[in-house]
Interface confidence: medium
């Protein structure tokens, strides 16, 4: 709305840099040929790039990553009744950050 | 995968809590009957509430929120030529996370 | 303050019953699993049952299977262990503990234990 | 049924390192956890999932798990670590214990 202005405090653009994220473990991460299982924990976070860029054409992308494997409890559920395994996750984390010329395909001619 | 075990760290859960999160203003939360203007900035931060509990049956909720009014700048574009105005958008930031139990709704019988 | 307090513990003659009873206090009892560990004078600990957060999954070490039956009662934050068929080598002491998960883990809680003895 | 192996006993000078094996058939395949009992008194946890120290242990105590072994370090050990430590893990559907190891810290 265009009204109370005078207690808004001017918007700060979120810059284009790594956050604290949280990314889900999904079950196909660790065995894409079974769904009698869980997954614990089922999130960790992650540094990920976000925010924007100063120019409509720039995104925000990393610019340097690195892969992080973490061990995770793998929970089959036999008869009703648990056995733990380790298993290993390999997140994804963002070390820095860019803003990047968008790349559009030219239409061919 | 259940391999190489040995450089992987223990998974820690991303815990319920407040973070940082970035926020995009869409066009519409300032006009929705015109789509002929800009908004700067595009995205600002804003504190969300994520993570997981340590249940199944609860979820990360925000047990506290606080409206924060922002200004923004409203650039239309007439005859090819920007004119700048204020608007204000109403940000929601979350102040404090807890893990609420899911209400699954009951079958009726 | 978070704590377990063990009660129930006793003299009973070999072949008798006796039921513990645990109360959680200070966390949310219905969102963690809970264990029985005992310790036989002057021994180690021994693994004795799990519930899990909701009491659907419960399971027993071999040595009490048949006998020992676990439960609990949410409404009332407590945790149950109804033993039967007593024998001498079921003297121990007794103790409730809390794993941090639904699934179980490690036990982060413990209680400072009730004493159970059967001798004739 | 699974079982867990640790020495009855492990002797150290204060302020050495003290470390504590617990073995077990793929024992680096379960995730292992460490607890301190002193004599009277309940168990308390010190190191969880092979390496994890809760909240208020002191940082003197760390662990690890691979192959066979799981080991429990106590670096610059101090006359308040001399207790009994047993390792457990979670395997087919119990919870399994070691028979414990006694720490003493010579004087």
């Known amino acids: 709305s265009l009204g109370s202005l005078a207690a808004a405090e001017p918007a700060v653009i979120a810059e284009c840099k790594t956050r604290t994220e949280v990314f889900q473990i999904s079950r196909n991460l660790i065995d894409r040929t079974n769904a009698n299982f869980l997954v614990w924990p089922p999130c960790v976070e992650v540094q990920r790039c976000s925010g924007c860029c100063n120019n409509r054409n720039v995104q925000c992308r990393a610019s340097q990553v690195q892969m992080r494997p973490v061990q995770v409890r793998k929970i089959e559920i036999v008869r009703k009744k648990p056995i733990f395994k380790k298993a290993t996750v390999t997140l994804e984390d963002h070390l820095a950050c860019k803003c990047e010329t968008i790349v559009t395909p030219r239409p061919v001619t | 995968s259940l391999g190489s075990l040995a450089a992987a760290e223990p998974a820690v859960i991303a815990e319920c809590k407040t973070r940082t999160e970035v926020f995009q203003i869409s066009r519409n939360l300032i006009d929705r009957t015109n789509a002929n203007f800009l908004v700067w900035p595009p995205c600002v931060e804003v504190q969300r509430c994520s993570g997981c509990c340590n249940n199944r049956n609860v979820q990360c909720r925000a047990s506290q929120v606080q409206m924060r009014p922002v200004q923004v700048r409203k650039i239309e574009i007439v005859r090819k030529k920007p004119i700048f105005k204020k608007a204000t958008v109403t940000l929601e930031d979350h102040l404090a996370c807890k893990c609420e139990t899911i209400v699954t709704p009951r079958p009726v019988t | 303050e978070v704590q377990l307090v063990e009660s129930g513990g006793g003299l009973v003659q070999p072949g008798g019953s006796l039921r513990l009873s645990c109360a959680a206090s200070?966390?949310?009892?219905?969102?963690?699993?809970m264990s029985w560990v005992r310790q036989a004078p002057g021994k180690g600990l021994e693994w004795v049952s799990y519930?899990?957060?909701?009491?659907?999954?419960?399971y027993y070490a071999d040595s009490v299977k048949g006998r020992f039956t676990i439960s609990r009662d949410n409404s009332k934050n407590t945790l149950y262990l109804q033993m039967n068929s007593l024998r001498a080598e079921d003297t121990a002491v007794y103790y409730c503990?809390?794993?941090?998960?639904?699934?179980?883990?490690?036990?982060?809680?413990w209680g400072q234990g009730t004493l159970v003895t059967v001798s004739s | 049924s699974y079982e867990l192996t640790q020495p009855p006993s492990v002797s150290v000078a204060p302020g050495q390192t003290a470390r504590i094996s617990c073995s077990g058939d793929?024992?680096?395949?379960?995730?292992v956890h460490w607890y301190q009992q002193k004599p009277g008194q309940a168990p308390v946890l010190v190191i969880y999932?092979?390496?994890n120290r809760p909240s208020g242990i002191p940082e003197r105590f760390s662990g690890s798990n691979s192959g066979n072994t799981a080991t429990l370090t106590i670096s610059g050990t101090q006359a308040e670590d001399e207790a009994d430590y047993y390792c457990?893990?979670?395997?087919?559907?119990?919870?399994?214990f070691g028979g414990g190891t006694k720490l003493t810290i010579k004087r």
């Open positions: 519930i899990s957060d909701d009491g659907s999954l419960k």
């Open positions: 200070g966390f949310t009892f219905s969102s963690y699993a």
């Open positions: 503990a809390r794993h941090p998960y639904w699934y179980g883990g490690q036990l982060d809680l």
């Open positions: 793929s024992l680096g395949s379960y995730f």
């Open positions: 999932d092979d390496s």
């Open positions: 457990s893990a979670f395997t087919h559907n119990s919870d399994v």
